[in-house]
């Protein structure tokens, strides 16, 4: 798979492959994988990809199921890249406060917060 | 501050306090703090709170600015609790795939993805 494929297209294709291979993936009835209790997905990327690793090691490879796991590893690579950009730029307090305000604003409007 | 205050109310109050104390917080003109390059904030919570720690250590405490940092530490506590819930429950592949599908769907529609 060329890594030049835009991440957004990669995600769309992966969603389709996930539906296609569902039956094969659920074949192992004893396997248990951590599933987050909440929907703040970005907080749980590490656990999600650990789960994908567990699933991959238990799934018979070949054909397009291999492409599914390859796609997922490219998505992980993208997210890891995003995480590296979290602390890459040292800015003035003003810019940090703007970002903090934005972060809290997003938390206020978009996060799934339990009472 | 009672930790019983709902997190959503805590976030709102913190946003207000941030505006109130902006002038005091930006007083240190030499201080530089890592600021994420992208807007996928949840990926960067660790770095954001490290930055808050740096800012707190450089800010003269007292009055409601102390409340601001107390609030921010309660928000961190909430996020840490959410992170603990990422891997707490081991479920069957079926549930994991439903969650993975949701995660990829959210990535597809809500994440800020650079080309």
């Amino acid at each position: 798979i060329p890594t030049e494929i835009p991440t957004s297209a990669l995600v769309k294709e992966t969603l389709a492959l996930l539906s296609t291979h569902r039956t094969l993936l659920i074949a192992n009835e004893t396997l248990r994988i951590p599933v987050p209790v909440h929907k703040n997905h970005q907080l749980c990327t590490e656990e999600i990809f650990q789960g994908i690793g567990t699933l991959e090691s238990q799934t018979v490879q070949g054909g397009t199921v291999e492409r599914l796991f390859k796609n997922l590893s490219l998505i992980k690579k993208y997210i890891d890249g995003q995480k590296k950009k979290c602390g890459a730029e040292r800015r003035r307090v003003n810019q940090f406060l703007d970002y903090l305000q934005e972060f809290l604003g997003v938390m206020n409007t978009e996060w799934i917060i339990e009472s | 501050i009672p930790t019983e205050i709902p997190t959503s109310a805590l976030v709102k109050e913190t946003l207000a306090l941030l505006s109130t104390h902006r002038t005091l917080l930006i007083a240190n003109e030499t201080l530089r703090i890592p600021v994420p390059v992208h807007k996928n904030h949840q990926l960067c919570t660790e770095e954001i709170f490290q930055g808050i720690g740096t800012l707190e250590s450089q800010t003269v405490q007292g009055g409601t600015v102390e409340r601001l940092f107390k609030n921010l530490s309660l928000i961190k506590k909430y996020i840490d609790g959410q992170k603990k819930k990422c891997g707490a429950e081991r479920r069957r592949v079926n549930q994991f795939l439903d969650y993975l599908q949701e995660f990829l769907g959210v990535m597809n529609t809500e994440w800020i993805i650079e080309s």
Partner: antibody, heavy 119, light 107 residues
């Protein structure tokens, strides 16, 4: 407070369809899955399926697949359960129930909607 | 599908009695089991989740135990308002399945 309020009782003829609504209030609708459960007169409880209002994804008990359709209207925080090709054995009270987390326990239940199928 | 077998199907007891209801799953469901109470003509109400975790507001006389395939609901001292039907529910795998219910009646 968190509430699920269901639509009123329905009487339908065999072969017809019924659509039961479940209006959520007191919480963010997209945060929790909505499950549907039914109970025939004097019988036990039976899971029909769940819908995730976050992404409109639904999953069904095979027994109801093809006949039950779960949908949501995010603008009104309402979940719907439509059952087609009704037969007399579909006479039951239909409940919606909120999932506390992801595939978790049912923490809030609707009051139930009686659907009677009779010619 | 996972079968849930509840026993007894009904029991008669007096106020103050200790009551035990059991539920057996046809396969390992970890601890993903809840206990539900239903009074005649009313909506069900969840009492316990994750096999042994009491839901807020539920009296402490209710307790749950077990993991894997065998589970128990205990009411330590039966109260008049506890006369109802009790169901177990496995939410470990799809489709979720209920036990057939245990009716607790006044002796």
């Amino acid at each position: 407070q968190v509430q699920l309020v269901q639509s009123g009782a329905e009487v339908k003829k065999p072969g017809a369809s019924v659509k039961v609504s479940c209006k959520a209030s007191g919480y963010t609708f997209t945060n929790h899955h909505i499950n549907w459960v039914r109970q025939a007169p004097g019988q036990g409880l039976e899971w029909i399926g769940y819908i995730n209002p976050y992404n409109d994804y639904s999953r069904y008990n095979q027994k109801f697949k093809g006949r039950a359709t779960l949908t949501v209207d995010k603008s009104t925080s309402t979940a719907y359960m439509e059952l087609s090709s009704l037969r007399s054995e579909d006479t039951a009270v239909y409940y919606c129930a909120r999932d506390y987390g992801n595939f978790w326990y049912f923490d809030v239940w609707g009051q139930g909607t009686l659907v009677t199928v009779s010619s | 599908d996972i079968q849930m077998t509840q026993s007894p199907s009904s029991l008669s007891a007096s106020v103050g009695d200790r009551v035990t209801i059991t539920c057996k799953a046809s396969q390992d469901i970890n601890s993903y089991l809840s206990w539900i109470q239903q009074k005649p003509g009313k909506a069900p109400k969840t009492l316990i989740h994750r096999a042994d975790r009491l839901i807020d507001g539920v009296p402490s006389r209710f307790s749950g135990s077990g993991s894997g395939q065998d589970f128990t609901l205990t009411i330590s001292s039966l109260q008049p308002e506890d006369f109802a039907t009790y169901y177990c529910l496995q939410y470990d795998d799809f489709p979720y399945t209920f036990g057939q219910g245990t009716k607790v009646e006044i002796k």
